[in-house]
């Protein structure tokens, strides 16, 4: 019925408006409604203007697509001509009363199907149903995959490509690890993958300034070290360095009026030359304090070395040796005076004897046939050496003596000249000043070491060698090497060290073989004014340990391997060091700081006397230890 109506309307249009000209009213009669009439009539007038006589040629050249008036007018009511719909997006166009309807293809929308639907943004079908990438296209979309993935047959889902299986050599010498969409060439910690060489290369962490002071790079890692000899230790972050702090302050007060006799390990502490007119006899008076049992207090000789007098200590008692053209004598006597107290000593040459007094009490009288030193033309010339003698004298002594003496002298009066000469020399020299108060023991100031040669081989024992050590310690800082055995190749096959514990105000004791800690005794309170007693015994099979808290035999899987390393070193030659390490690499031991504090050492039943050391840092005190700093009310 609708098409019949259309045909009627078409016939009326032809008759009324093409074959004849029609006005708007006549046109309304054709369409029988205003909207269509209002739409048609202006366009009809355009057709008329286009196809009036004389304008045809121009019309053909114009944009008008119609060949004649009929076709121009007939096309006006058809809303789909010319096509209003987007050609790409429409499926069909339906003409309506002064309107049209574009039916869109799937994927298009809008009145004219001009808008593409973005299926990738469809809330009802997230990401267009794609598992990875959704690509919107005009009127459609498609799914794609990221690099390293392939599309499954459903064209929506992606599957990871395992590059490691596809190309086994893709990482060269590194380990290939497949990861979603990619692969990684993995290197062990401390190594970095080199794309060019397809291999793992060691990272030189040291070049990246990882460490505050010293850095040692090794394949796959690095270790930071701090210069313990300068008083630093590694901080907890294992990178930065911190000062080895004092845990037990000591009273290091000195006085220039007190002459320290052990300033030099080898050599004389003070040398004075006298040429005096009014004195023809030798005299020396002084107060003396020591815990040392043997050593030279003073040695005096004539300018030509023909006569000499030695005042020394042996077994804690005063000994006098003398030699001149008339006689040669040695005498020891009096009470033991190495008691740490001030003892007044006087040695005076009388006409026929030499008188030795302690606390003004005569303890020795040595007969002499003539003057000890002969005046030359009325002047007595004498050389006086404190705490030692010239090297050549050693062979001339009546009885050999170890000259080293850790002691102090005060209130001296030499050759009746009072303090003159000595005071001037020592006033400006801090290291010649003695500590005001001392206790028994040996003091390591944290600045040097002592070296001993000890033979650890025990032929009578099946073990072949053994190291039995007893340490009595009173540390002043919580970190330092107490004892070390050092091989000729600059390794440290055995060391006993102190380190500050992670738990506050306590210390750990480390036993190490080379740079490996074989045992750690944790959290001991060693920084106290009381001495701590440590013992350990080690041979090629065992390691036994005794601390204030426990006695135990150490055994663990790795110990035998470490003891084998020690055994090998002990079969060669080792030097024994107390108080620290010689110049060995920083990486040779877990700790390299000097020990600071008091320490007495007994090795294989022998109490070590620092005066007997092969070498000793001048600042180490062999037989005196500073007292613990007592806080006064004012301080």
């Amino acid at each position: 019925a609708n098409s019949l109506l259309e045909e009627t309307k078409q016939g009326n249009l032809e008759r009324e408006c093409i074959e004849e000209l029609c006005n708007k009213e006549e046109a309304r009669e054709v369409f029988e409604n205003d909207p269509e009439t209002d739409y048609f009539y202006p366009k009809y007038l355009v057709c008329l203007r286009s196809f009036q006589t004389g304008l045809f040629t121009a019309a053909r050249q114009s944009t008008n697509a119609y060949p004649d008036l009929r076709s121009c007018v007939n096309a006006i009511p058809d809303q789909c001509s010319p096509l209003p719909c987007n050609e790409d997006g429409y499926m069909s166009c339906k003409d309506g009363k002064a309107s049209f309807t574009c039916t869109c293809k799937p994927g298009w929308q809008g009145e004219k199907c001009e808008f593409d639907i973005n299926e990738c943004k469809d809330p009802s079908n997230i990401n267009g149903g794609c598992s990875q990438i959704c690509d919107n296209t005009p009127g459609s979309y498609h799914c794609s995959c990221k690099n390293g993935f392939v599309m499954l047959s459903n064209k929506k889902d992606c599957k990871d490509v395992d590059e490691c299986s596809l190309k086994p050599s893709i990482c060269g010498t590194a380990v290939c690890k497949n990861i979603p969409g990619d692969f990684e060439c993995e290197c062990p910690e401390g190594y970095r993958y080199n794309l060019k060489s397809k291999s793992c290369e060691d990272i030189d962490e040291c070049s990246e300034n990882m460490c505050a002071q010293l850095c040692v790079n090794y394949p796959g890692g690095y270790t930071c070290y701090c210069d313990g000899k300068k008083g630093f230790k590694l901080a907890q972050d294992q990178k930065s360095c911190e000062v080895v702090s004092v845990c037990l302050p000591l009273n290091l007060d000195t006085k220039y009026e007190l002459l320290y006799l052990a300033e030099q390990f080898a050599g004389v502490v003070l040398y004075l030359k006298f040429r005096l007119p009014e004195i023809s006899r030798f005299s020396a008076e002084f107060d003396f304090r020591t815990y040392d049992s043997e050593g030279v207090i003073l040695y005096a000789e004539s300018i030509d070395h023909s006569a000499w007098l030695l005042i020394a200590l042996r077994g804690g008692k005063i000994e006098v040796q003398l030699k001149n053209e008339h006689t040669s004598k040695i005498t020891t006597g009096g009470d033991v005076i190495n008691n740490g107290l001030w003892n007044m000593v006087s040695v005076e040459e009388l006409e026929h004897s030499i008188s030795i007094k302690i606390a003004k009490e005569a303890v020795m009288d040595i007969n002499k046939p003539g003057p000890l030193f002969k005046p030359e033309n009325g002047l007595l010339e004498t050389k006086v050496y404190f705490a030692g003698f010239p090297r050549k004298v050693e062979s001339e002594l009546i009885k050999p003596i170890n000259p080293r003496l850790d002691g102090c002298i005060r209130s001296w009066n030499l050759m009746k000249q009072g303090a003159s000469g000595i005071k001037e020399i020592i006033q400006e020299k801090q290291n010649k000043h003695c500590l005001v108060t001392v206790e028994k023991g040996s003091y390591y100031p944290g600045s040097g070491i002592a070296q001993f040669h000890i033979d650890y081989n025990n032929v009578s024992s099946a073990e072949g060698w053994h190291v039995n050590v007893t340490l009595n310690i009173r540390p002043s800082t919580g970190t330092g090497v107490m004892l070390a055995l050092v091989s000729g190749n600059n390794t440290v096959p055995f060391a006993v060290s102190l380190v500050d514990s992670t738990s506050e105000k306590s210390q750990d004791i480390l036993l190490s073989v080379e740079n490996t800690v074989i045992y750690r005794i944790q959290a001991l309170s060693l920084c106290s004014d009381q001495q701590s007693h440590l013992e350990f015994r080690v041979n090629r099979n065992n390691l036994e340990l005794s601390t204030p808290l426990k006695i135990e035999t150490i055994s663990h899987e790795d110990l035998q391997r470490q003891l084998a390393v020690l055994d090998k070193a002990m079969k060669a030659k080792v030097a024994t060091y107390l108080g620290g390490l010689p110049d060995v690499p920083f990486s040779a031991t877990p700790v390299n700081a000097f020990y600071n504090g008091c320490m007495e050492v007994n090795i294989n039943g022998v109490q070590l006397d620092l005066d007997e050391a092969i070498s000793k840092h001048n600042d180490i005190r062999a037989h005196s230890c500073p007292s613990v700093w007592k806080k006064t009310k004012n301080s």
Epitope: L272, K273, F274, R275, L276, P277, E278, E376, N377, G378, L379, M415, K416, Q417, G418, S420, G421, K423, E424
Partner: antibody, heavy 121, light 109 residues
Framework: QVQLVQSGAEVKKPGASVKVSCKSS????????MHWVRQAPGQGLEWMGW????????NYAQKFQGRVTMTRDTSISTAYMEMSRLRSDDTAVYYC??????????????WGQGTLVTVSS | QAVVTQESALTTSPGETVTLTCRSS?????????ANWVQEKPDHLFTGLIG???NRAPGVPARFSGSLIGDKAALTITGAQTEDEAIYFC?????????FGGGTKLTVL
């Protein structure tokens, strides 16, 4: 530096006494022997004696024994030479001279500027 | 009492080496006489040069040196300078006292 500064010129009558001072600075006074030497007009030098400032011990040349006294005051590092019973031939410039090495007698290293003592009636 | 004798005067030229001597009336001068040499410049300015025969006093130029030559004590000036023009006294120790020589007037022309 070492300095020996002597007291000023004196004019004395015969039979009188004179006391010349010698102040020492720049060194430890007590460690060095002090000598006294004089030079009469147009004459050479004449050694008079020494004092040990530490002990106060003295020794005088025989010629001056009994007339010369050497003393010291360690608190002000000063040595003194007193001469009594002055005669006209005691007119001279008097010098103090200090040993140059501590406790080492007999090296006359440092000298004072001299004190002229005139004995005239 | 011993008498100590010196040359009364000597003349030298700048840069030359000159030796002054000191003789003892008691015999040879030895190290035990602890010979001293003292320089006197105008205005009674005395300076110790040498003590104990050959010990130069502090601050004394190295051109001055002391020694024993034969039986005499000697002061040698190596490379004399015009400012060395002065009177030089020697003093010798005799057991308990010093004796000075009469002095040598050195002219440096």
């Amino acid at each position: 530096q070492v300095q020996l500064v002597q007291s000023g010129a004196e004019v004395k009558k015969p039979g009188a006494s004179v006391k010349v001072s010698c102040k020492s600075s720049g060194h430890t006074f007590t460690g060095y022997y002090m000598h006294w030497v004089r030079q009469a007009p147009g004459q050479g030098l004449e050694w008079m004696g020494w004092i040990n400032p530490n002990s106060g011990d003295t020794n005088y040349a025989q010629k001056f024994q009994g007339r010369v006294t050497m003393t010291r005051d360690t608190s002000i590092s000063t040595a003194y030479m007193e001469m009594s019973r002055l005669r006209s031939d005691d007119t001279a410039v008097y010098y103090c001279a200090r040993d140059s090495q501590i406790l080492w007698f007999g090296e006359l290293g440092y000298w004072g500027q001299g004190t002229l003592v005139t004995v005239s009636s | 009492q011993a008498v100590v004798t010196q040359e009364s005067a000597l003349t030298t030229s700048p840069g030359e080496t000159v030796t002054l001597t000191c003789r003892s009336s008691t015999g040879a001068v030895t190290a035990s006489n602890y010979a001293n040499w003292v320089q006197e410049k105008p205005d009674h300015l005395f300076t110790g040069l040498i003590g104990s025969t050959n010990n130069r006093a502090p601050g004394v130029p190295a051109r001055f040196s002391g020694s024993l030559i034969g039986d005499k004590a000697a002061l040698t000036i190596t490379g004399a300078q015009t400012e060395d023009e002065a009177i030089y006294f020697c003093a010798l120790w005799y057991s308990d006292h010093f004796v000075f020589g009469g002095g040598t007037k050195l002219t440096v022309l």
